[in-house]
Amino acid sequence: YNNFRRSMDSIGRRQYQVQHGSCSYTFLLPETDNCRSPGSYVPNAVQRDAPLDYDDSVQRLQVLENIMENNTQWLIKLENYIQDNMKKEMVEMQQNAVQNQTAVMIEIGTNLLNQTAEQTRKLTDVEAQVLNQTTRLELQLLEHSLSTNKLEKQILDQTSEINKLQDKNSFLEKKVLDMEDKHIVQLRSIKEEKDQLQVLVSKQNSIIEELEKQLVTATVNNSVLQKQQHDLMETVHSLLTMISPSKSPKDTFVAKEEQIIYRDCAEVFKSGLTTNGIYTLTFPNSTEEIKAYCDMETSGGGWTVIQRREDGSVDFQRTWKEYKVGFGNPSGEHWLGNEFVFQVTNQQPYVLKIHLKDWEGNEAYSLYEHFYLSGEELNYRIHLKGLTGTAGKISSISQPGNDFSTKDADNDKCICKCSQMLTGGWWFDACGPSNLNGMYYPQRQNTNKFNGIKWYYWKGSGYSLKGTTMMIRPADF
């Protein structure tokens, strides 16, 4: 009978024993202790740092390769052994029981081959598992490395942010403390100022009371003085009459009074009043008065302002009469009045300066070295000579001068009524390159306007200016 047994020897090596009648064959296989069985494999059981696991896997792979190599060598040896050493027995067996022995040997060979194939397959499986595990571990390692980097970066960023915030906080705390200190100081000084002001107010109140008393006294004194002056004048008058009946005393006193009458701002300036502001001027050869704004700063001062545009607060679409006598507020938008300008510019040669402002912060001027107006019978026709300045080389007031036109007095050279078309009173041509009395348009609405505040040779046809000032001064100032 045949008996086929597989067992382990005392030191754990696998052995295959074949019993055939009185013959016993024992095969010792190479050691495979380093190969773990698939059941002992625990996936993802990472117990320590990945790099050590990885080295371990490499080592195990090397051992497995060695085992495979050993198995292969052993199989070759087995084949050789069977071929060489079994020849004798084969002969004997052939003699005794050829068929039976052959069957046994075939069975043994088959079993051995099966066993080897099984072992090889298992080894291949283990190798594949090890490779898979290695790959998986490598990926995990890479992921861990990336996430560690990411976390480290986040921690660094947060740390930096925290530091920044701490710095900022410290700075703000310091600032708040500083401000508190400042506020305390300021409050103290304000309180002191308030106390001082209260003292000052009470002082001023008493001064005012004193002045009021003095004023009452002065008024009384003034009345007395006026009466005395009147009496004296009468006495002088009678004395003069007695001495020289042919000479009128009135002339002497009128001449004295004329010294405090100002025909224009140049006279105001020359009298020592050199502050910008509104002054009362008197028409030449008349007692009629007019309030005018005097510019005492521009180009040496002494300028009588005859027109100003600055904010659109005054309507310039006015009648002939209104342009004749003037309108508006001398310290703001206004037209001084054609009649006064006609009269004053016919006394002596005057210069005209026109100052312009656009909406982009630019300023320019036109200066006419000789300027005067004709009288009302000639429609206050404008006369200009000698243009200089930065608001255009060509005059934006048409030359020769045109008559003045208003909505109710059409004296222009257009088939239309320019004053009606373009609004405002002006020395229109047909209708011409300027109109400083046009509609006032605010910023961003000041372009593409037919009827705005126009000075063609500075800003072109459709541009409406931000501000204008027309002022006059004697040429010999």
Partner: antibody, heavy 121, light 107 residues
Framework: QVQLVQSGAEVKKPGSSVKVSCKAS????????MVWVRQAPGQCLEWMGY????????GYNQKFEGRVTITADESTSTAYMELSSLRSEDTAVYYC??????????????WGQGTLVTVSS | DIVMTQSPDSLAVSLGERATINCKAS??????VAWYQQKPGQPPKLLIY???TRDTGVPDRFSGSGSGTDFTLTISSLQAEDVAVYYC?????????FGCGTKVEIK
């Protein structure tokens, strides 16, 4: 005699630009404003803008603001109108015309022969 | 923008008869109105400005009138060469605007 001669017809793709020229002769180019007016098929006349060749000042119809640019070359007495971001609705005859007055954009006394601009993909 | 509304859209008149075209402005334009004549394939031609002034070389059969918001162009005795489209135009304020035209034909 006073004459305005415009450039020839143009066919343009949507989104592109067109530049039409207008050469003036028979008068002093800088003495009058030049306007551009267009006439789409079956539509009203439409004022696009003007240029004052004396100082280069321009004014545009808000409808075309940002798309139209009017320029002038004094040396050649030529005005130009460029319209960008063309669309099919811009298909029209474009005219240049002279204003009667330098200082104001009044009425238009001399016209160019017109330039047909077709916008088609 | 000021809207200029022309009426009628078209007009058929016998030769030698009067043709009247109206134009209404959406707001007061004073007398800042011009009239143009446009024949097929030609640019517009100025006829009237400042509502009633004929341009140089324009026959006296053409006349304009009106102020404020209502304006009229009259052809006193229609001639064959007057067949055209007529446009009114306001230049009182920016942007200048045009009517959409009145086509005049011979009946």
């Amino acid at each position: 005699q006073v004459q305005l001669v415009q450039s020839g017809a143009e066919v343009k793709k949507p989104g592109s630009s067109v530049k039409v020229s207008c050469k003036a002769s028979g008068y002093s180019f800088t003495d009058y404003n030049m306007v551009w007016v267009r006439q789409a098929p079956g539509q009203c006349l439409e004022w696009m803008g003007y240029i004052d060749p004396y100082n280069g000042g321009t004014g545009y119809n808000q409808k075309f603001e940002g798309r139209v640019t009017i320029t002038a070359d004094e040396s050649t007495s030529t005005a130009y109108m460029e319209l960008s971001s063309l669309r099919s609705e811009d298909t029209a005859v474009y005219y240049c015309a002279r204003t009667r007055d330098r200082y104001d954009v009044w009425y238009f006394d001399v016209w160019g022969q017109g330039t047909l601009v077709t916008v088609s993909s | 923008d000021i809207v200029m509304t022309q009426s009628p859209d078209s007009l058929a008149v016998s030769l030698g008869e009067r043709a009247t075209i109206n134009c209404k402005a959406s707001q007061d334009v004073y007398i800042a109105v011009a009239w143009y004549q446009q024949k097929p394939g030609q640019p517009p031609k100025l006829l009237i400005y400042w509502a009633s002034t004929r341009d140089t070389g324009v026959p006296d059969r053409f006349s304009g009138s009106g102020s404020g918001t209502d304006f009229t162009l009259t052809i006193s005795s229609l001639q064959a060469e007057d067949v055209a489209v007529y446009y009114c135009h306001q230049y009182s304020s920016y942007p200048p605007t045009f009517g959409c035209g009145t086509k005049v034909e011979i009946k």
